[in-house]
C-alpha cells in the first residue's frame, strides 16, 4: 500500500497519513536509522517501478540521508519531499512553523486556558488559521479531514488531544528546540521545587531573569542535552509562551515536566 | 566553595555618595543574584536591594528606592552598591550575599560606612 | 511587610542543654508546600552564616545539633547539645515575597 502511494504524481492527506504509519516503525513521530534507509529504498524502488524520475527534493532528500547513519527527519520534512496535495502541505510550510518563538506564539493563542493542551475544536481553529494566513480556503469537510489527519498524527498518546510537545512536531527536526528538553525533563516533584525555588521573589511566576538563571544551570548539569551558547534563543523561545512576561507554572511545565510524580 | 570579598571601611561627608564593592569568586556569577544589606549598630538586618547578575536587573526594598543603586561588572565578577546623599542614618555594617535560590548562603565579611562632619 | 517576632530577645543556656528559639511571622510564610523561612547565625565581627534554609534544611557543613521546624507562621530553631562556640545572635528571616524582612534577633549566651 505505501509503495502504491509513494508511486503516486499527488498524494492526498490521508494517503500521506499511511506512508508515515509504514515507515514510522516504533511510533516515536520520527524517522530515524533504519526507518529513514527503508524510506529511501522504497521510495527510489516505486518510482522507478511506475517509471517516474526522483523529483528534486526526493533527490536532494536521498542524497542527504542515503548514506548517513544519524539521519532523523520528522512528519515536516517528509511532506516536503513527498508530492503532498497543497493545502495540506501548506500547514507545514506556513510562517507560524517556520521559527520556535512563532510556534511558541501560536500555541500561547489557542492553548487559552493554560491547559497544556490543544483539543479538536482548537486544532480545528489553529488549522484554519494556517490555512487563511497562506490565503487558502478549505470546506469544513476537508478542515475536519485534515483536524483529523493532524490528530492521528501527532496524538502519540492518543487521549484525543495535543500536547505541546506532540503539537511541535509541525516544526522542523532543526528547529524544533523542545527535542533538547526531551532528556532532561523533570519529575512533577523536582519541577515543583525548581519553580519555587527560581521564583526569587515568591510572586507565582518566573521572568526573564530567573528563567535565565535557571536555564544557565540547567545547560550547567546538562552538558550533553544543552548548549549554553543558545542560552538566548532558549529563553526567547520559552519567553514566547509567557503572558507579558509571566511565565506561569502550568506554561514552563510544559518543557520542563515530564509527568506527575 | 564561593567567596565574596567587600572593599574597606569607608568615611564619608553627609551628603557625599559612596561606592561599595564586592568581589566574588568560585561560584557561577552569572547564574546568581547579589543582595545588599544594612546593618545598625545593636540592631537587626534590613534587605536593601538584590541584582540578577545575569542581566543586571534590580529589585529594591521601597524603603531604599532613590538611596542606592545597585550594578555588576561580570567581566570581574563584582557587584557595586552606590549610595547616595548620606546622612548620619545611613552609618552602619553593609553585606553583599549571594542568592542563586531563596536563601543567602555566601555573605562578604562586610564593609563598615561612617557618615560624619 | 510581614514582620518576624522573635523569642526570647535573649537566651543564656547552659553547656549541654537545649536552646530553642521561636520566630512568628505576621502572616503565612508558607507556599506550595515550602516554607521560605530561614535561620542565621551571627556573631561579633563576623559576616551572618545560613544555618537553616526552607524552615527545616541543614546548610551543608552546619552540625546536625541544629535544627528547624515550623509552617505557616510559627518557626522554631533547636540547638541541642549547646556548646560553647554556639554563643551567638541567631536572626530568622523569610523569602516569602517582597521585602525579605529579618526577626529582630536572640541572642545566646552560654551560663
Known amino acids: 500500500m505505501a509503495e502504491s502511494h509513494l508511486q503516486s504524481s499527488l498524494i492526498t492527506a490521508s494517503q500521506f497519513f499511511e506512508i508515515w504509519l509504514h515507515f514510522d516503525a516504533d511510533g516515536s513521530g520520527y524517522l530515524e536509522g533504519k526507518e529513514l534507509q527503508n524510506l529511501i529504498q522504497e521510495l527510489q524502488q516505486a518510482r522507478k517501478k511506475a517509471g517516474l524520475e526522483l523529483s528534486p527534493e526526493m533527490k536532494t532528500f536521498v542524497d542527504q540521508y542515503g548514506q548517513r547513519d544519524d539521519g532523523k527527519i520528522g512528519i515536516v520534512e517528509l511532506a516536503h519531499v513527498l508530492p503532498t496535495e497543497e493545502n495540506f502541505l501548506l500547514l507545514f510550510r506556513c510562517q507560524q512553523l517556520k521559527s520556535c518563538e512563532e510556534f511558541m506564539k501560536t500555541w500561547r493563542k489557542y492553548d487559552t486556558d493554560h491547559s497544556g493542551f490543544i483539543e479538536t475544536e482548537e486544532l480545528k481553529n489553529f488549522l484554519k488559521d494556517l490555512l487563511e494566513k497562506a490565503n487558502k480556503t478549505v470546506d469544513d469537510t476537508k478542515l475536519a479531514e485534515y483536524t483529523d489527519l493532524m490528530l492521528k498524527l501527532f496524538d502519540s498518546n492518543n487521549d484525543g488531544k495535543l500536547e505541546l510537545t506532540e503539537m511541535a512536531r509541525l516544526l522542523p527536526v532543526q528547529e524544533n528546540f523542545l527535542l533538547k528538553f526531551q532528556g532532561i525533563k523533570m519529575c512533577g516533584k523536582e519541577f515543583n521545587k525548581a519553580f519555587e525555588l527560581y521564583d526569587q521573589d515568591g510572586n507565582g511566576y518566573i521572568d526573564e531573569n530567573e528563567l535565565d538563571a535557571l536555564l544557565k544551570d540547567l545547560c550547567e548539569k546538562n552538558k550533553q542535552d544543552l548548549d549554553i551558547n543558545n542560552i538566548t534563543t532558549y529563553k526567547k523561545n520559552i519567553m514566547a509562551l509567557s503572558d507579558g512576561g509571566k511565565l506561569y507554572r502550568t506554561d514552563l511545565a510544559l518543557i520542563l515536566c515530564a509527568g506527575d510524580n | 566553595q564561593g567567596q565574596m570579598q567587600q572593599s574597606g571601611a569607608e568615611l564619608v561627608k553627609p551628603g557625599a555618595s559612596v561606592k561599595l564593592s564586592c568581589k566574588t569568586s568560585?561560584?557561577?556569577?552569572?547564574?546568581?543574584?547579589i543582595s545588599w544589606l544594612k546593618q545598625k549598630p545593636g540592631q537587626s538586618l534590613e534587605w536593601i536591594a538584590w541584582?540578577?547578575?545575569?542581566?543586571?536587573?534590580?529589585n529594591y526594598n521601597q524603603k531604599f528606592t532613590g538611596k542606592a543603586q545597585l550594578t555588576v561588572d561580570t567581566s570581574s565578577s563584582t557587584a557595586y552598591m552606590q549610595f547616595s546623599s548620606l546622612t548620619a542614618e545611613d552609618s552602619a555594617i553593609y553585606y553583599c550575599?549571594?542568592?542563586?535560590?531563596?536563601?543567602?548562603?555566601?555573605w562578604g565579611q562586610g564593609t563598615t560606612l561612617t557618615v560624619s562632619s | 511587610d510581614i514582620v518576624l517576632t522573635q523569642s526570647p530577645a535573649s537566651l543564656p543556656v547552659s553547656l549541654g542543654q537545649r536552646a530553642t528559639i521561636s520566630c512568628r511571622a505576621s502572616k503565612s510564610v508558607s507556599t506550595s508546600g515550602y516554607s521560605y523561612m530561614h535561620w542565621y547565625q551571627h556573631k561579633p565581627g563576623q559576616p551572618p552564616k545560613l544555618l537553616i534554609y526552607?524552615?527545616?534544611n541543614l546548610e551543608s557543613g552546619v552540625p546536625a545539633r541544629f535544627s528547624g521546624s515550623g509552617s505557616g507562621t510559627d518557626f522554631t530553631l533547636n540547638i541541642h547539645p549547646v556548646e560553647e562556640e554556639d554563643a551567638a545572635t541567631y536572626y530568622c528571616?523569610?523569602?516569602?515575597?517582597?521585602?525579605?524582612?529579618f526577626g529582630g534577633g536572640t541572642k545566646l549566651e552560654i551560663k
Open positions: 541584582i540578577y547578575a545575569g542581566t543586571g536587573d534590580t
Open positions: 528571616q523569610h523569602t516569602r515575597e517582597l521585602p525579605w524582612t
Open positions: 550575599a549571594r542568592h542563586k535560590y531563596r536563601y543567602l548562603d555566601y
Open positions: 526552607l524552615a527545616s
Open positions: 568560585g561560584f557561577t556569577f552569572s547564574s546568581s543574584y
